[in-house]
Interface confidence: medium
């Protein structure tokens, strides 16, 4: 089943997010991902925890998952590198790098996204864009076309309140508001983009979606710059 958590969003402009990837298992969408280099897609480590007996591939240049599109191409995966400290059952270090079988063919609809290297929190209230093919309602309806939503960043202190995530949000994580608009199941591994720069990756715990007291949790990529660079080197 797809992992992660977009509720309350709308259909994205086709191919306006050329960095967007669909991580697929046995030909079906599993998680989001983001092209960070010609041959590398960043996603969430949890996405692979149940994929051991399946074929993992990455779809780039897509808006619709099912319809033919000139820019769409499915890539095999050469190497899957989860963060070495990731655990299947915690949200910490929930990052995965997938090396494509070959360099992606770049164009208007396929382009890597610059990612944040300066390890500094995004200012609370900043509007950031999250996109994905995750479920769009509580009944579990999955969209065929890419959805997106703008979400304000939530300060860590509020996110860590006992009524919210009760101290689980470390300095390597960030939160975004989740009042009816939220990332949801199937969006895990997808990008949180602030000012045209990748700031976060949707984590893939089993959080309820669209509840303002359970904000969306995102892994801060700047906190993992050294690891990302070491794998891509």
């Amino acid at each position: 089943p797809p992992r992660g958590r977009i509720l309350g969003g709308r259909e994205a402009e086709a191919h306006a997010r050329p960095y967007m990837a669909s991580v697929q298992l046995n030909g079906a969408h599993l998680c989001g991902g983001v092209l960070v280099a010609e041959q590398w897609v960043l996603s969430a480590a949890h996405c692979l925890e149940d994929a051991a007996d399946g074929k993992v591939q990455v779809l780039l240049g897509a808006h619709s998952l099912s319809q033919p599109e000139p820019s769409k191409r499915l890539y095999d995966v050469l190497r899957a590198v989860p963060h070495p400290d990731s655990q299947p059952d915690t949200i910490d270090h929930d990052l995965l790098l997938l090396q494509l079988s070959e360099k992606a063919t770049l164009g208007p609809a396929v382009r890597p996204l610059p990612w944040q290297r300066v390890d500094r929190d995004v200012a609370p209230g900043t509007l950031c864009d999250v996109a994905g093919w995750g479920i769009v309602n509580h009944a579990g309806r999955r969209p065929d076309s890419l959805q997106h939503v703008l979400l304000p960043v939530l300060d860590r202190a509020t996110c860590n309140r006992r009524t919210h995530h009760d101290g689980a949000i470390t300095e390597r994580l960030m939160c975004a508001e989740s009042n009816r608009r939220d990332s949801c199941k199937g969006d895990s591994g997808g990008p949180l983009v602030c000012g045209g720069v990748l700031e976060g990756v949707v984590t893939s715990g089993s959080r309820v979606c669209g509840n303002r007291k359970k904000p969306g949790i995102y892994t801060r990529v700047a906190s993992y710059a050294a690891w990302i660079d070491s794998v891509l080197a």
């Epitope: 480590a45 993992v56 995966v77 050469l78 190497r79 989860p82 655990q87 059952d89 997938l98």
Partner: antibody, heavy 121, light 111 residues
Framework: EVQLVESGGGLLQPKGSLKLSCAAS????????MNWVRQAPGKGLEWVAR??????????YYADSVKDRFTISRDDSQSMFYLEMNNLKTEDTAMYYC????????????WGQGTSVTVSS | DIVLTQSPASLAVSLGQRATISCRAS??????????MQWYQQKPGQPPKLLIN???NVESGVPARFSGSGSGTDFSLNIHPVEEDDIAMYFC?????????FGGGTKLEIK
Amino acid sequence: EVQLVESGGGLLQPKGSLKLSCAASGFTFNTYAMNWVRQAPGKGLEWVARIRSKSSNYATYYADSVKDRFTISRDDSQSMFYLEMNNLKTEDTAMYYCVRDRGYYYVMDYWGQGTSVTVSS
Amino acid sequence: DIVLTQSPASLAVSLGQRATISCRASESVEYYGTSLMQWYQQKPGQPPKLLINAASNVESGVPARFSGSGSGTDFSLNIHPVEEDDIAMYFCQQSRKVPWTFGGGTKLEIK
């Protein structure tokens, strides 16, 4: 320091039942998957069962040799882990180890000292 | 099930020499660039101890004389130089597919 302490082993007759326990300490128990692995006297190791955490809906997995007879469970509030064994057979005689696994590659990194189960008529 | 065949079943090595234990899998244990193969050491009356994960990663606290190599279906554990403390049974184990399986074991003795 990670510690796993098994208990509940004993001598019983075929078709009998037994419940093994494992007390865990020294790590955040509720975020780890746990396993039972057994070793018959003078023999090799055999993986028996695995249970994942709450965030993975406590998914369970069993070896074919124990399926429908053994049940794995856990109590996160007590950091306890269990193996309920029914319809025991002589070939279930073994040392039973409680084992933690870590990471996406399912590495069994910490093992308890084991508890002995003997099934004999 | 993936069957792991270890060889030799027993091995006698002089102190200071090299011991090599092999493990062959009935099918590949590769998972997108990582070999899901572990090695354990078990001394009499003790539980197994993890030595090496993912074919070649030596666990923290394990002496540098232990090393692992291999990919696909063929793997080996090397101990060099062998010390008295290394007398034990050694097992390989795959975590590529459930059920996870172990090799039959290799008994290391000192000549």
